[in-house]
């Protein structure tokens, strides 16, 4: 939602967290700003303090409950407001009617581990974190592998169009250090976006056996 010269973007992690970023042209003086969440059909409301992340943008996380609790559903609408202190009052700087399951961004996958590694192949698994049971199997993944001498941006993306929490990387070079990352996205939601990339998993392929043709 855009009000005046500000932009206010929020995502729901599908369980108990709404993360928001508010950017404002022309930095405010030292003032305190918050995000307030008011669901249309629930007894609770929640607030978080916006903290600067750059010259003109602030971020905060609305913690709605225990990490794995299902605090919102597809029918919920949450009024989100950015409020900034002016004098003793609060001023509404931005406002949006937020549909959580239209604005999803899951947590980065966790627990990456090498299941099996060979000279040219590596099987890696991971887990999804704090993802709603509502998705059932309606998730997709993207993965990338960092090869020596390259950057993450240069790494080709591997797409897994189903809920598959493992991958078998092929055509790797023996005795070589690699890094691997994965991210997840629900198929649901008009404004849904990819999760952050997972923490990189470092692994090394096995050296080619001496005297053998590889």
């Amino acid at each position: 939602a855009v009000n005046g010269t500000s932009q206010f973007t929020c995502f729901y992690n599908s369980r108990a967290n709404i993360s928001c970023v508010w950017s404002q042209d022309g930095a405010l003086q030292d003032t305190s700003c918050q995000v307030h969440a008011w669901p249309d059909r629930r007894r609770w409301n929640q607030t978080c303090e916006l903290l600067p992340v750059s010259q003109a943008s602030w971020a905060c996380n609305l913690i709605l409950g225990a990490p794995d609790s299902q605090k919102l559903t597809t029918v919920d609408i949450v009024t989100l407001r950015v409020l900034c202190r002016e004098g003793v009052r609060w001023r509404v700087m931005a406002i949006q009617d937020f549909k959580p399951f239209e604005n999803l961004r899951l947590m980065a996958p966790i627990s990456l581990q090498v299941v099996h590694v060979e000279t040219h192949r590596c099987n890696i698994s991971w887990e999804i974190s704090q993802a709603s049971h509502y998705f059932e199997r309606h998730l997709e993944f993207e993965a990338r592998t960092l090869s020596p001498g390259h950057t993450w941006e240069e790494a080709p993306l591997l797409t897994l169009k189903q809920k598959q929490e493992w991958i078998c990387l092929e055509t790797l070079t023996p005795d070589t250090q690699y890094e691997f990352q994965v991210r997840v996205k629900p198929l649901q939601g008009e404004f849904t976006t990819w999760s952050p990339w997972s923490q990189p998993l470092a692994f090394r392929t096995k050296p080619a056996a001496l005297g053998k043709d590889t």
Partner: antibody, heavy 121, light 112 residues
């Protein structure tokens, strides 16, 4: 019905202090801000500052800083405005007015009847 | 501080005729949230001020529809479509966009 009832007229000598009260009724006192506005005889309106009774937080117009103190007593739903080091130019009608804690629409919606303060030697 | 300048100082009007009051701010009073917090207050003789219009053109509850507000940026107008006897008094514009909030000097509406 929202009502703000202010204390009676005061006559003060230069250099003295005056404390004006504003008793609120008809709404939850701690949910709204109380602003103070003054009107010198035959003059316009001047916003002095305000207090949020919910936490006692105050904001004063720079013009009055150091001389004005706003307080509240939530047990009797009353706000106070004290002005010190009075001078003749402080002769005015002092109003309290209610305002929303979140400034969505307007600054002040209901006003007290005003308290006349005369500063004279 | 934002200076609010009203004109005219005095406005003699005939009952049933329209009246128009101008208010000019010394700087743009569009708040950084995109709203313009320009308000109009009426003060009848011997009474406290009363809110008429907020955010330039919105009538406060109970305010007759003969009162209307308009304008943007730095120039604002309060119009009374047909003046009635009870409209006599002083009208103040007020800006709530930039602290300290400030009032105009007032316009006195009287019957000819």
């Amino acid at each position: 019905e929202v009502q703000l009832v202010q204390s009676g007229a005061e006559v003060k000598k230069p250099g003295a202090s005056v404390k004006v009260s504003c008793k609120a009724s008809g709404y939850t006192f701690t949910d709204y801000v109380i602003s103070w506005v003054r009107q010198a005889t035959g003059q316009g309106l001047e916003w002095m500052g305000e207090i949020y009774p919910g936490d006692g937080n105050t904001y004063y117009n720079e013009m009055f800083k150091g001389r004005v103190t706003m307080t509240r007593d939530t047990s009797i739903s009353t706000a106070y405005m004290e002005l010190s080091s009075l001078r003749s130019e402080d002769t005015a009608v002092y109003y309290c007015a209610r305002g929303s804690y979140t400034y969505d629409n307007y600054a002040m919606d209901f006003w007290g009847q005003g308290t006349t303060v005369t500063v004279s030697s | 501080d934002v200076v609010m300048t009203q004109s005219p100082l005095s406005l003699p009007v005939t009952l049933g005729q329209p009246a128009s009051i101008s208010c000019r701010s010394s700087q743009n009073i569009v708040h950084s949230n995109g709203n313009t917090y320009l308000e109009w207050y009426q003060q009848r003789p011997g009474q406290s001020p009363r809110l008429l219009i907020y955010k330039v053109s919105n009538r406060f509850s109970g305010v007759p529809d003969r009162f209307s507000g308009s304008g943007s940026g730095t120039d604002f107008t309060l119009k009374i479509s047909r003046v009635e006897a009870e409209d006599v008094g002083v009208y103040y514009c007020f800006q709530g966009s930039h602290i300290p909030w400030t009032f105009g000097g007032g316009t006195k509406v009287e019957i000819k």
